[in-house]
């Protein structure tokens, strides 16, 4: 049995930040789970992890330098990514593993979400012309 | 039997144009085939079609408003997309169908290519300040 995951096909991060909601066909209440967000078609970069269990507070961390936070719903985890760079435009996949109690479950690979980071393109002031920031 | 397709995981279109090469585990020489490029996680938009057979010149067209050209190799088709918009940043999938000679063949779904359209961010001249183009 596999958990199904739903994600938006595309999100635009206009100000270098975005909320990506991962919706699961499974209730995470009082489960030990590890929800993660992965970047790239090969899911090579683990962007952010939300780890929850029944005895501790939610742990949210990134081992790959992303500025992320996470929020837990009964059947969802929302990843809030900030300070994204334009070159971090990519496809992002939600993953979930439930370790306890049994059975051990993980998800069918989702379709992913294209996060298009538009960022802020700063132009010089007309009074103080200088090189534009791409 | 299915044809396997290889694509770059990501391409950046700095000047609103990009070459996307679709490499096939099949020799297209003297075959009647239809190679196509599809946009979106659900491949909903057929961006460009390259149609080839042994008696006619290669036909390249888009029915969805994309400016595209195509080039044929023995085991590849390269799609050249121009005038891309920043909001056309998405995942693009190569597809191939061989109609003749039998048997009819098509491809295993590929991993796709993220095309990140950076475009040109134009700043107003300091002498003629005006709204910047995002």
């Amino acid at each position: 049995n596999k958990i199904l995951v739903k994600q938006s096909p595309m999100l635009v991060a206009y100000d270098n930040a975005v909320n990506l909601s991962c919706k699961y066909s499974y209730n995470l209440f009082s489960r030990e789970f590890r929800a993660s967000l992965h970047k790239g078609l090969d899911s090579a970069v683990e962007v952010c992890v939300v780890y929850g269990n029944y005895s501790q507070q939610l742990q949210v961390y990134s081992k790959t330098g992303f500025n992320c936070d996470g929020k837990l719903g009964n059947e969802s985890v929302t990843f809030y990514l900030q300070n994204l760079y334009v070159n971090q435009t990519d496809i992002y996949f939600c993953k979930i593993e439930v370790m306890y109690p049994p059975p051990y479950l993980d998800n069918e690979k989702s379709n992913g979400t294209i996060i298009h980071v538009k960022g802020k393109h700063l132009c010089p002031s007309p009074l103080f012309p200088g090189p534009s920031k791409p | 039997n299915k044809i396997l397709v290889k694509q770059s995981p990501m391409l950046v279109a700095y000047d609103n144009a990009v070459n996307l090469s679709c490499k096939y585990s099949y020799n297209l020489f003297s075959r009647e085939f239809r190679a196509s490029l599809h946009k979106g996680l659900d491949s909903a938009v057929e961006v460009c079609v390259v149609y080839g057979n042994y008696s006619q010149q290669l036909q390249v067209y888009s029915k969805t408003g994309f400016n595209c050209d195509g080039k044929l190799g023995n085991e590849s088709v390269t799609f050249y997309l121009q005038n891309l918009y920043v909001n056309q940043t998405d995942i693009y999938f190569c597809k191939i169908e061989v109609m003749y000679p039998p048997p009819y063949l098509d491809n295993e779904k590929s991993n796709g290519t993220i095309i990140h359209v950076k475009g040109k961010h134009l700043c107003p001249s300091p002498l003629f300040p005006g709204p910047s183009k995002p």
Partner: antibody, heavy 116, light 107 residues
Framework: EVQLLESGGGLVQPGGSLRLSCAAS????????MSWVRQAPGKGLEWVSA????????YYADSVKGRFTISRDNSKNTLYLQMNSLRAEDTAVYYC?????????WGQGTLVTVSS | DIQMTQSPSSLSASVGDRVTITCRAS??????LNWYQQKPGKAPKLLIY???SLQSGVPSRFSGSGSGTDFTLTISSLQPEDFATYYC?????????FGQGTKVEIK
């Protein structure tokens, strides 16, 4: 048919290291958590460690925490147990087991003897 | 950690006897209790999972019951091949823990 085959056991001196491997076949390895369970001579079963399908979550018994490391290579369908700072009380048959609802499949075991 | 206590630690019985082994958890584990059979020199074999579900291929003379903290494994009519050691194991909360085992011997 599900098969688990352990290897890497043997005789090692106290303080030494060993790396156990478990080659899996007959199921989608990356979709299942895996565990190591050991059994000292004439004793009962003792759970040692567990790892999630992706390898992202790991668990250890207090008796081995800080000395043993569980890992997996899903591309090779192989589970590992790196055992450092071995003690006489680590002498046991080590089993790898597939963990879903329970430990539903077990390997045949590999004997680790820690002795000077 | 959750402690699992099995009783008895050993028992003698004859072919055809009804045998009952009990397992008690130090705190509630709902139905996350499994039973295994082990014969000398062999790996354990799963008999019952989730307290009462019979693993595929296991004879129907084996049954399990209980929830919360108290669980029972019953062999309705002991067969010669059933002489072995039986272990309970909880998987509801990490770490997984086993009972100390019950050895079923021929009387």
């Amino acid at each position: 048919e599900v098969q688990l085959l352990e290897s890497g056991g043997g005789l090692v001196q106290p303080g030494g290291s060993l790396r156990l491997s478990c080659a899996a076949s007959g199921f989608t390895f990356s979709s299942y958590a895996m565990s190591w369970v050991r059994q000292a001579p004439g004793k009962g079963l003792e759970w040692v460690s567990a790892i999630s399908g992706s390898g992202g979550s790991t668990y250890y018994a207090d008796s081995v925490k800080g000395r043993f490391t569980i890992s997996r290579d899903n591309s090779k369908n192989t589970l590992y147990l790196q055992m450092n700072s071995l003690r006489a009380e680590d002498t046991a048959v080590y089993y790898c087991a597939k963990r879903y609802i329970a430990f539903d499949y077990w390997g045949q075991g590999t004997l680790v003897t820690v002795s000077s | 950690d959750i402690q699992m206590t099995q009783s008895p630690s050993s028992l003698s019985a004859s072919v055809g006897d009804r045998v009952t082994i009990t397992c008690r958890a130090s705190q509630s584990i709902s139905s996350y209790l499994n039973w295994y059979q082990q014969k000398p020199g062999k790996a354990p074999k799963l008999l019952i999972y989730a307290a009462s579900s019979l693993q595929s291929g296991v004879p129907s003379r084996f049954s399990g019951s209980g929830s919360g903290t108290d669980f029972t494994l019953t062999i309705s009519s002991l067969q010669p091949e059933d002489f072995a050691t039986y272990y309970c194991q909880q998987g509801g909360m990490p770490p997984d823990t086993f009972g100390q085992g019950t050895k079923v011997e021929i009387k």
